[in-house]
Interface confidence: low
């Protein structure tokens, strides 16, 4: 015999208390597949989370993060605060990248500048706390007088952030 509950579509549940009639999901709940015996409670986007997609009877709410934060984890299970480019998030908040490192995003950690000499290349553009160095041709490729490359400006020291 076919399970009568299998006829209940998404957005409903098979109500055992009412002779297995398909009842609509109550407010703030959903069922994304047919044949469900219960509806799941909708996710609530509270605090640092904000609603990206409202809950419907057939699909859960989706959250993202309030301004100044970004999602982490599957389905935006966590919000982590943004830093500015040139910074990384530490336990004490956003801190400038140390000299010799950079971060070109609002998340993640500061990473060391590329060491051009490891590839036998020269530094074409010096790095900053927001940008990696740009490696140019190897020094041997630059015969005297043939170079159109201007000498790189001194690397910018990380700026001070009043904290």
């Amino acid at each position: 015999l076919q399970d009568p509950c299998s006829n209940c579509p998404a957005g409903t549940f098979c109500d055992n208390n009412r002779n297995q009639i398909c009842s609509p999901c109550p407010p703030n709940s959903f069922s994304s597949a047919g044949g469900q015996r219960t509806c799941d409670i909708c996710r609530q986007c509270k605090g640092v989370f904000r609603t990206r997609k409202e809950c419907s009877s057939t699909s859960n709410a989706e959250c993202d993060c309030t301004p100044g934060f970004h999602c982490l984890g599957a389905g935006c299970s966590m919000c982590e605060q943004d830093c500015k480019q040139g910074q990384e998030l530490t336990k004490k908040g956003c801190k400038d990248c140390c000299f010799g490192t950079f971060n070109d995003q609002k998340r993640g950690i500061c990473r060391p500048w590329t060491n051009c000499s490891l590839d036998g290349k020269s530094v074409l553009v010096n790095g900053t706390k927001e940008r990696d160095v740009v490696c140019g041709p190897s020094p041997a490729d630059l015969s005297p007088g043939a170079s159109s490359v201007t000498p790189p400006a001194p690397a910018r020291e990380p700026g001070h952030s009043p904290q």
Partner: antibody
Framework: QEQLVQSGAEVKKPGASVKASCKAS????????IHWVRQAPGQGLEWMGR????????EYAQKFQGRVTMTRDTSTSTVYMELSSLRSEDTAVYYC????????????WGQGTSVTVSS | DIQMTQSPSSVSASVGDRVTITCKAS??????LSWYQQKPGKAPKLLIY???RKVDGVPSRFSGSGSGTDFTLTISSLQPEDFATYYC?????????FGGGTKLEIK
């Protein structure tokens, strides 16, 4: 020594605009956000918005949307706040303030610019 | 917008008293709350951020606590220089919003 120095007091007529300046010294404004907060006589503090001097992006409180414009001149480390269509209830002291967004918000303040709107 | 309801709006107290000021957010604000002190004719001064982290130089008699929607600033033993107006601020979301302020007066 981190410091924010604001422009002097202004007296304006209703309907006019005011442009207050805020000059930073002792730090790189591109590493911070600059906020503007106002305080009407005998009243509390009201956040108007902020600008990221690194790129000029700004966020404004809905209440001031369309009337306020925040700009910056990185060459002089100065941020500006322009408020248009002034009315008497805009009479207030306008403060610029700075601080890393999440670490210690608004920890350095200018001395304030007094704006009086009167016919 | 997130509303910040601060109470009491004013309080009279004596030197040496313990004073508690509360701030209630209209929705959870995680730990994105700070406290400011303002004296007449002066710009506000940041005392505490992220609920309970004191700024360097702020005396140990000031402390902050709370989470979610309910937050408290406590001054354990009032000193003459503490008589001022205190404001809470939420900075979880735009627009950032201040509480209405608590004026701390000498009894």
């Amino acid at each position: 020594q981190e410091q924010l120095v604001q422009s002097g007091a202004e007296v304006k007529k209703p309907g006019a605009s005011v442009k207050a300046s805020c000059k930073a010294s002792g730090f790189n404004i591109q590493d911070t956000y600059i906020h503007w907060v106002r305080q009407a006589p005998g009243q509390g503090l009201e956040w108007m918005g902020r600008i990221d001097p690194a790129n000029g992006n700004s966020e404004y409180a809905q209440k001031f949307q369309g009337r306020v414009t925040m700009t910056r001149d990185t060459s002089t480390s100065t941020v500006y706040m322009e408020l248009s269509s002034l009315r008497s209830e805009d009479t207030a002291v306008y403060y610029c303030t700075t601080g890393n967004l999440h670490y210690a918000l608004m920890d350095y303040w200018g001395q304030g610019t007094s704006v009086t709107v009167s016919s | 917008d997130i509303q910040m309801t601060q109470s009491p709006s004013s309080v009279s107290a004596s030197v040496g008293d313990r004073v508690t000021i509360t701030c209630k957010a209209s929705q959870p604000i995680n730990t994105y709350l700070s406290w400011y002190q303002q004296k007449p004719g002066k710009a506000p001064k940041l005392l505490i951020y992220r609920v309970n982290r004191k700024v360097d130089g702020v005396p140990s008699r000031f402390s902050g606590s709370g989470s979610g929607t309910d937050f408290t600033l406590t001054i354990s033993s009032l000193q003459p220089e503490d008589f001022a107006t205190y404001y809470c601020l939420q900075y979880l979301d735009f627009p950032y919003t201040f509480g209405g302020g608590t004026k701390l007066e000498i009894k």
